[in-house]
């Protein structure tokens, strides 16, 4: 018996078999910056982490998820001053005593070198040069992301 997640995964794979992919020509919305296969929106106002999370949701996006050190560096290159901090989608899970991304996955300890404490009410921010643990109630800027998905053309099987 497959779990619902496994079943969903199989359904997605089957639907992929019926499509061919071509490079997406999808552009980022106005005011969003493209970084590889993502669109990023750097806020100009400040908010606590929870409000930042909610703001991204209202924009049909999520707080930034960073896959690896390379993506971190490329994102940091877009930050124009060392005294600007941005929330990303990573906070401390007290129950699991670990850093947890908002998509449910845990931080790979090699990905980000976090300066500061891993404790309750701690959320992660990035600056031009570093990654910081800050209190989630701190009002700083934040980064929303949208994934750029490739455009798919339906291929109908021969009858």
């Amino acid at each position: 018996q497959k779990s619902s997640i496994e079943k969903c995964s199989v359904d997605i794979q089957q639907s992929r078999n019926k499509t061919t992919e071509r490079p997406g020509l999808l552009n980022c919305p106005i005011y969003w910056q493209q970084l590889r296969e993502k669109c990023l929106l750097f806020s100009h106002t400040v908010n606590p982490w929870n409000n930042s999370l909610a703001d991204c949701s209202t924009k049909e996006s999520s707080l930034l998820l960073i896959r690896d050190k390379d993506e971190l560096i490329h994102t940091q290159n877009l930050i124009r001053d060392k005294a600007i901090l941005f929330w990303i989608g990573l906070n401390f899970s007290l129950s699991e005593k670990n850093w947890k991304w908002i998509n449910g996955s845990f931080l790979n300890s090699n990905d980000l070198e976090i300066r500061g404490d891993a404790k309750e009410n701690s959320c992660i921010s990035i600056s031009q040069t570093s990654v910081y643990s800050e209190y989630c109630s701190t009002e700083i800027r934040w980064i929303c992301q949208k994934e750029l998905t490739p455009v798919r053309n339906k291929v109908y099987p021969d009858s």
Partner: antibody, heavy 119, light 107 residues
Framework: EVQLVESGGGLVQPGGSLRLSCAAS????????MSWVRQAPGKGLEWVSA????????YYADSVKGRFTISRDNSKNTLYLQMNSLRAEDTAVYYC????????????WGQGTLVTVSS | DIQMTQSPSSLSASVGDRVTITCRAS??????LNWYQQKPGKAPKLLIY???SLQSGVPSRFSGSGSGTDFALTISSLQPEDFATYYC?????????FGQGTKVEIK
């Protein structure tokens, strides 16, 4: 009510050291960046240094870099400025202020403490 | 560093006058401009943040305008308690910098 109270100022000889403190109350101290701003006698305002809420990140004006160190103790709701290798041009009233991340404005200020560097 | 230049350096005005102080940045700072009031022997007080937002508790006769490089602080009807020195400040980039101040004196 938000309150910031500086202390530790005084007369010091050139080359000497001084440590300023700023006791904060009336707000969640650890959730705010904090700054030091100074004002030489009869002159304008000059930003000196800032520190993030957790204390993890610090920023300095070029005029004090390498000589001054900003720090904080969130368990004591206190901000510090360690000033070494003091010069005559460091003579000023030193204010602590709430704010320091861009684009924060300094929305609350202490009353200031006077530092005089003279032989 | 971003230089902030205020004008005039000082001005004389009477109670009830409309007063405007200008501040120019050496490069574009968007709307990251704040205004402070300082009275002799006292700490500065935030009046306006983000170029035009009135700080809580500040009388509505104070207003701010501008974006990019040119900004203004206007006092619509000068009151006795408004005689002070006013500073602009940019929070666009570090180091944070202030204008040299404008002293508003009684005519």
């Amino acid at each position: 009510e938000v309150q910031l109270v500086e202390s530790g100022g005084g007369l010091v000889q050139p080359g000497g050291s001084l440590r300023l403190s700023c006791a904060a109350s009336g707000f969640t101290f650890s959730s705010y960046a904090m700054s030091w701003v100074r004002q030489a006698p009869g002159k304008g305002l000059e930003w000196v240094s800032a520190i993030s809420g957790s204390g993890g990140s610090t920023y300095y004006a070029d005029s004090v870099k390498g000589r001054f160190t900003i720090s904080r103790d969130n368990s004591k709701n206190t901000l510090y400025l360690q000033m070494n290798s003091l010069r005559a041009e460091d003579t000023a009233v030193y204010y602590c202020a709430r704010g320091g991340y861009l684009p924060d404005a300094f929305d609350y200020w202490g009353q200031g403490t006077l530092v005089t560097v003279s032989s | 560093d971003i230089q902030m230049t205020q004008s005039p350096s000082s001005l004389s005005a009477s109670v009830g006058d409309r007063v405007t102080i200008t501040c120019r940045a050496s490069q574009s700072i968007s709307s990251y401009l704040n205004w402070y009031q300082q009275k002799p022997g006292k700490a500065p007080k935030l009046l306006i943040y983000a170029a035009s937002s009135l700080q809580s508790g500040v009388p509505s006769r104070f207003s701010g305008s501008g974006s990019g490089t040119d900004f203004a602080l206007t006092i619509s009807s000068l009151q006795p308690e408004d005689f002070a020195t006013y500073y602009c400040q940019q929070t666009y980039s570090t180091p944070l910098t202030f204008g040299q101040g404008t002293k508003v004196e009684i005519k």
